[in-house]
């Protein structure tokens, strides 16, 4: 059974992941730039089901494409430093999903824009945090 301290650690990691995802979405929503239109043409795979920490495998597999899209946005008005940001997210995701079990991610048939993708994973984090508190 999970201990109180392990639950607290999980919650903190989820909160950090949530904030990072919110930061990206905010940065993109602030974009009044032709690059935004281009960013929205990139398609992301969405999880068929995302209700447990192991489903973060689906997010992990999309981090490289996410970094590539964010690299497009680099400018003096975009302060997210994609390499550092994605590296931080990757560390959190690896810790949260654990490495004991190998989970094969199942994706939905429909792809999504970066905005839809981020909103989906933000909602995922929020829903898991809600069950922990």
């Amino acid at each position: 059974a999970p201990t109180s301290s392990s639950t607290k650690k999980t919650q903190l990691q989820l909160e950090h992941l949530l904030l990072d995802l919110q930061m990206i979405l905010n940065g993109i929503n602030n974009y009044k730039n032709p690059k935004l239109t281009r960013m929205l043409t990139f398609k992301f795979y969405m999880p068929k089901k995302a209700t447990e920490l192991k489903h973060l495998q689906c997010l992990e597999e999309e981090l490289k494409p996410l970094e590539e899209v964010l690299n497009l946005a680099q400018s003096k008005n975009f302060h997210l430093r994609p390499r550092d940001l994605i590296s931080n997210i990757n560390v959190i995701v690896l810790e949260l999903k654990g490495s004991e079990t190998t989970f094969m991610c199942e994706y939905a048939d429909e792809t999504a824009t970066i905005v839809e993708f981020l909103n989906r994973w933000i909602t995922f984090c929020q829903s898991i945090i809600s069950t922990l508190t």
Epitope: L12, M23, L80, D84, I122
Partner: antibody, heavy 113, light 107 residues
Framework: QVQLVQSGAEVKKPGASVKVSCKAS????????VHWVRQAPGQGLEWMGI????????SYAQKFQGRVTMTRDTSTSTVYMELSSLRSEDTAVYYC??????WGQGTLVTVSS | DIQMTQSPSSLSASVGDRVTITCRAS??????LAWYQQKPGKAPKLLIY???NLETGVPSRFSGSGSGTDFTLTISSLQPEDFATYYC?????????FGPGTKVDIK
């Protein structure tokens, strides 16, 4: 529990820049993302942005985009908020907040010619 | 951006009164709402987070309820130290946004 101590009051001329510091103590510096919120005299609270102290990357409210820069120095457990091209409407108390529940005491910035 | 509105903007009450402040979000924010108390010249103080969770050290006369778009802060029996301005805040999505505040003063 983390404590936040901010730098002292500043008086600036229009067009100048101001850099407010927020020093953390009492807990792991990187544990909390730091928000900056300001409050003009007699007005409500306005969110300016957030910085991740471990990664050093930040995200800003659209209103301040291009004028605000949030940075951090992990060696001194300090985050900074710099606001440029100051105008009289920027006269306010500027607060840093760790995770939005632990707040600094505030720094009054007065912009006046 | 998510807009937050509060009502009333001010109210006069007496010690011992039950006080209710409402907050409305322009779109659903789940339970991602906090309430703050602010006294003149001081930083805001967190009272309630996640719509109904009482922050450590906050008296139990304060309570919060609601989800989605409609939220309430209740002070069951107003004390002299409760005369202040109260703000709601959503943190469901960035930018974080605050309500305009409700000033509670002495009748």
């Amino acid at each position: 529990q983390v404590q936040l101590v901010q730098s002292g009051a500043e008086v600036k001329k229009p067009g100048a820049s101001v850099k407010v510091s927020c020093k953390a103590s009492g807990d792991t510096f990187t544990r909390y993302y730091v928000h900056w919120v300001r409050q003009a005299p007699g007005q409500g609270l306005e969110w300016m942005g957030i910085i991740n102290p471990s990664g050093g990357y930040a995200s800003y409210a659209q209103k301040f985009q291009g004028r605000v820069t949030m940075t951090r120095d992990t060696s001194t457990s300090t985050v900074y908020m710099e606001l440029s091209s100051l105008r009289s409407e920027d006269t306010a108390v500027y607060y840093c907040a760790a995770g939005l529940f632990i707040w600094g005491q505030g720094t009054l910035v007065t912009v006046s010619s | 951006d998510i807009q937050m509105t509060q009502s009333p903007s001010s109210l006069s009450a007496s010690v011992g009164d039950r006080v209710t402040i409402t907050c409305r979000a322009s779109q659903s924010i789940g339970r991602w709402l906090a309430w703050y108390q602010q006294k003149p010249g001081k930083a805001p103080k967190l009272l309630i987070y996640s719509a109904s969770n009482l922050e450590t050290g906050v008296p139990s006369r304060f309570s919060g309820s609601g989800s989605g778009t409609d939220f309430t802060l209740t002070i069951s029996s107003l004390q002299p130290e409760d005369f202040a301005t109260y703000y709601c805040q959503q943190y469901n999505r960035f930018p974080v946004t605050f309500g305009p505040g409700t000033k509670v003063d002495i009748k």
